[in-house]
Amino acid sequence: KNLKSPQKVEVDIIDDNFILRWNRSDESVGNVTFSFDYQKTGMDNWIKLSGCQNITSTKCNFSSLKLNVYEEIKLRIRAEKENTSSWYEVDSFTPFRKAQIGPPEVHLEAEDKAIVIHISPGTKDSVMWALDGLSFTYSLVIWKNSSGVEERIENIYSRHKIYKLSPETTYCLKVKAALLTSWKIGVYSPVHCIKTTVENELPPPENIEVSVQNQNYVLKWDYTYANMTFQVQWLHAFLKRNPGNHLYKWKQIPDCENVKTTQCVFPQNVFQKGIYLLRVQASDGNNTSFWSEEIKFDTEIQAFLLPPVFNIRSLSDSFHIYIGAPKQSGNTPVIQDYPLIYEIIFWENTSNAERKIIEKKTDVTVPNLKPLTVYCVKARAHTMDEKLNKSSVFSDAVCEKTKPGNTSK
């Protein structure tokens, strides 16, 4: 009896694991084995696929084959008993294109009101993702074990901290990886659960803000209790993206070590240009708080987020406001190459009732004004990145009188 070729061959690639599955064509024939050959692009000869020769099951693993994952390959399979079936050719494919991202490894640490999540690629030193290691982003789903109400957090890196949780509560989460450059979304990790600790005696410092004064940065925060000492640490923000290494070398800011006030001042030259994370910890001599929420600190934005400069064209029932780049000393405009949003406050000169307009555009109309009335306007800029969340100070107020009626055209 002629052996039929196997059918419906599926190639599953997860990270560096290459699995083949297929259907037997004839279930009634026993003791059949299966063998695969492969062929690389531009080659005529077929090569035996190691790990997939004389297989008795309908699955085999050819992960040991060192392939160029960006190169197209073709496979063929046949059944063997005393004789052999004809070859069945599988559609050619490129491993990288076909590959799925496997479940990442997840490591959790608990505090009283926070969980630290460390994420690593599921396959260490993966060949498949060797060129993409730093491009992985992750997303997670987290829920209270007791309620099951899910919250999704997108676009996180290999270290992420979730704040504002409840003490002594079990939280569960699962994480998946994505390579947005290749439009690849991975599979979820197993569910990991961890219980937050009993509430700490000392809360962490809150509301950390950085401002610039002269040639110094001023770091301020709020704290519940008096007679405390504080320390501040920084970390290069890009280190959160490092996929394999989970040793984060936070550094002290020398002028912010063991300070007794809820602020510290340090020279701007402590930091080179870049984006940093800052965190603050409180101590009363016996006990120590957990670290505060980490704030993102961009030296470029911090130094140059100046109040906007604007001109007003007055009409009878409105102002047209034209926002320009702020000026540095020497009257040169500052180039701000990050998106800004403008907050414009205006009020009648004789009144304290302020109205507000938020606008992304640099030409703004302030409507519904009364003719021949003096209105004052001030403006400030905000960064649109909610993680940076920086604002300039307000500009000086500019006051203008609206025109007489019927000049709105």
Epitope: L108, E109, A110, T197, L247
Partner: antibody, heavy 118, light 107 residues
Framework: EVQLQQSGADLVRPGASVKLSCTAS????????IHWVKQRTEQGLEWIGR????????KYAPKFQVKTTITADTSSNTAYLQFSSLTSEDTAVYYC???????????WGQGSTLTVSS | DIVMTQSQKFMSTSVGDRVSVTCKAS??????VAWYQQKPGQSPKALIY???YRYSGVPDRFTGSGSGTDFTLTISNVQSEDLAEYFC?????????FGGGTKLEIK
């Protein structure tokens, strides 16, 4: 394979100085912290301090701040623990340890025995 | 400084038994605790980190648990080679501190 090879036993006089060494293989010390830990006979473990070999930044336990200095030479992948004004209280085994992921001590050297005696 | 207290200096057990070594921190350390095993005449060896994660190569009869201030290292199905001293350590705040150690004796 990760290894931390420490210098051998030292017998020194009280008041003298000594420098213990710890040479790493199988990893680059710049990517980690190197810690030093003291253990006296039949006693527990005491953390002395650590260095970040990448930039030389150090941290010490207050009781060892004056007595010890930790340094590192990245070109030879070696960390050092130097003592000054030794007393019999400094007689102990000293371990160098790698501070790895999540700050934990994942690999320990074999220990250097320091004996201070007249 | 954070004090790590291992109240039992010695514990006696038999092969095949289950034993729990405890450690108490003087303040909340989250889950930033490690456990080490030191056999006579040897360097300490890392067993557990982040309170409950086992290092690769460590037999799964070693289990860590706890958070906040109370931590436990459990050895189920004790083997004769588990004769050693066990230390806990906090790795959240400098100076890092160790417990005084618990010596496990096999009957």
């Amino acid at each position: 394979e990760v290894q931390l090879q420490q210098s051998g036993a030292d017998l020194v006089r009280p008041g003298a100085s000594v420098k213990l060494s710890c040479t790493a293989s199988g990893f680059n010390i710049k990517d980690y912290y190197i810690h030093w830990v003291k253990q006296r006979t039949e006693q527990g473990l005491e953390w002395i301090g650590r260095i970040d070999p990448e930039d030389g930044e150090t941290k010490y336990a207050p009781k060892f701040q004056v007595k010890t200095t930790i340094t590192a030479d990245t070109s030879s992948n070696t960390a050092y623990l130097q003592f000054s004004s030794l007393t019999s209280e400094d007689t102990a085994v000293y371990y160098c340890v790698r501070g790895g992921n999540f700050y934990y001590f994942d690999y320990w050297g074999q220990g250097s025995t320091l004996t201070v005696s007249s | 400084d954070i004090v790590m207290t291992q109240s039992q200096k010695f514990m006696s057990t038999s092969v095949g038994d289950r034993v729990s070594v405890t450690c108490k921190a003087s303040q909340n350390v989250g889950t930033n605790v490690a456990w080490y095993q030191q056999k006579p005449g040897q360097s300490p060896k890392a067993l557990i980190y982040s309170a409950s994660y086992r290092y690769s190569g460590v037999p799964d009869r070693f289990t860590g648990s706890g958070s906040g201030t109370d931590f436990t290292l459990t050895i189920s199905n004790v083997q004769s080679e588990d004769l050693a001293e066990y230390f806990c350590q906090q790795c959240i705040n400098y100076p890092y501190t160790f417990g005084g150690g618990t010596k496990l004796e096999i009957k």
